[in-house]
């Protein structure tokens, strides 16, 4: 999916009002010094591409994020504010239902969510312009 035509300001507002708080809840008890951000993004469409990938694609050691509250709210925000996003996700959702697993918060998942917070932070940053 090409995130270029999303309403970035509306997604940002949704993130600040709810998604960010769910991410904080998920990470509660984790030290703020524990993880360095290693996943980066260069602009808002790229950030959303990386956010979608980390949130919804299972990875080695962390297969369960898609059913978390922050993930469901992320999906809702993208569906509302990114034209045509819902249609691209129908097949992916059906595949996900088939491999639903018990929720387990592993250290790998905590690290992945920390990376997500970093990607969202880059997405939210003001436009940094060289004067």
């Amino acid at each position: 999916y090409d995130f270029t035509n999303c309403d970035f300001e509306k997604i940002k507002a949704a993130y600040l009002s709810t998604i960010s708080k769910d991410l904080i809840t998920y990470m509660s008890g984790t030290k703020s010094t524990e993880f360095n951000n290693t996943v980066s993004c260069s602009n808002r469409p790229h950030c959303l591409t990386e956010i979608q990938s980390l949130t919804f694609n299972p990875t080695a050691g962390c297969a369960s994020l898609a059913k978390e509250m922050f993930a469901m709210k992320t999906k809702a925000a993208l569906a509302i504010w990114c034209p045509g996003y819902s249609e691209t996700q129908i097949n992916a959702t059906q595949a996900m239902k088939k491999r639903r697993k018990r929720k387990v918060t592993t250290n790998k998942c905590l690290e992945q969510v920390s990376q997500l917070q970093g990607l969202w932070r880059r997405f939210n940053r003001p436009l940094l312009k060289q004067q």
Epitope: E9, K12, A13, Y15, L16, S17, S20, I24, S32, T33, E34, F35, N36, N37, Q117, G118, W120, R121, R122, F123, N124, R125, P126, L127, L128, K129, Q131
Partner: antibody
């Protein structure tokens, strides 16, 4: 807990330079931008610039372009603000501040460093 | 550069009063606005981000609203510790300019 500790007060002569430090602790230093703001006596807050400690990328207010240099030392988790060609109008309290978790504000601030420029 | 204009520049009020401070941006900044409180000799403290989100630990008597170019900070019932100077700052693009400040004084 998150802390930003700045260097002590400075007295400088016009034309000189000053370098203020801001030592960060309690968080992953390279994950967050650092902003610098100043406040002249009895005046409002004035935004000076931002540094990304990870990349070293800097963004300055037009007013300070060419006179201010922001740097960061990852090994000591310390940010620096150097201001050159000082004049009396640069007398102010200088603050560093850390970007918030969400990237939409600056949530932790240093205690401030007072600079006095006088002949 | 985006200019931020606060009003009033100073305001006298009593404990228990409801007060509203406004901030106007010279162009559309959507919801990219923060509010700070500053007391004499201290660094600013974050109150509100994203125009309407209350920073953790900030009392619920503070609230922010607005979007686009018009924003406000409301204190529903003034407490003695609320007498301070308040600044808005836009967070849309660099330079991240501040408002001119509103000094809230005891009547």
């Amino acid at each position: 807990q998150v802390q930003l500790v700045q260097s002590g007060a400075e007295v400088k002569k016009p034309g000189a330079s000053v370098k203020v430090s801001c030592k960060a602790s309690g968080y992953a230093f390279t994950n967050y931008l650092i902003e610098w703001v100043r406040q002249a006596p009895g005046q409002g807050l004035e935004w000076m610039g931002i540094i990304n400690p990870e990349s070293g990328d800097t963004y300055y207010a037009q007013k300070f372009q060419g006179r201010v240099t922001l740097t960061a030392d990852k090994s000591t988790s310390t940010a620096y603000m150097e201001l050159s060609s000082l004049r009396s109008e640069d007398s102010a309290v200088y603050y560093c501040a850390k970007e918030s978790l969400t990237g939409s504000s600056y949530d932790y601030w240093g205690q401030g460093t007072t600079l006095t420029v006088s002949s | 550069d985006i200019q931020m204009t606060q009003s009033p520049s100073s305001l006298s009020a009593s404990v228990g009063d409801r007060v509203t401070i406004t901030c106007r941006a010279s162009e559309n900044i959507y919801s990219n606005l923060v509010w700070y409180q500053q007391k004499p000799g201290k660094a600013p403290q974050l109150l509100v981000y994203g125009a309407r989100n209350l920073q953790s630990g900030v009392p619920s008597r503070f609230s922010g609203s607005g979007s686009g170019t018009q924003f406000s900070l409301t204190i529903s019932s003034l407490q003695p510790e609320d007498f301070a100077t308040y600044y808005c700052q836009h967070f849309y693009e660099t330079p991240l300019t501040f408002g001119t400040g509103t000094k809230l004084e005891i009547k």
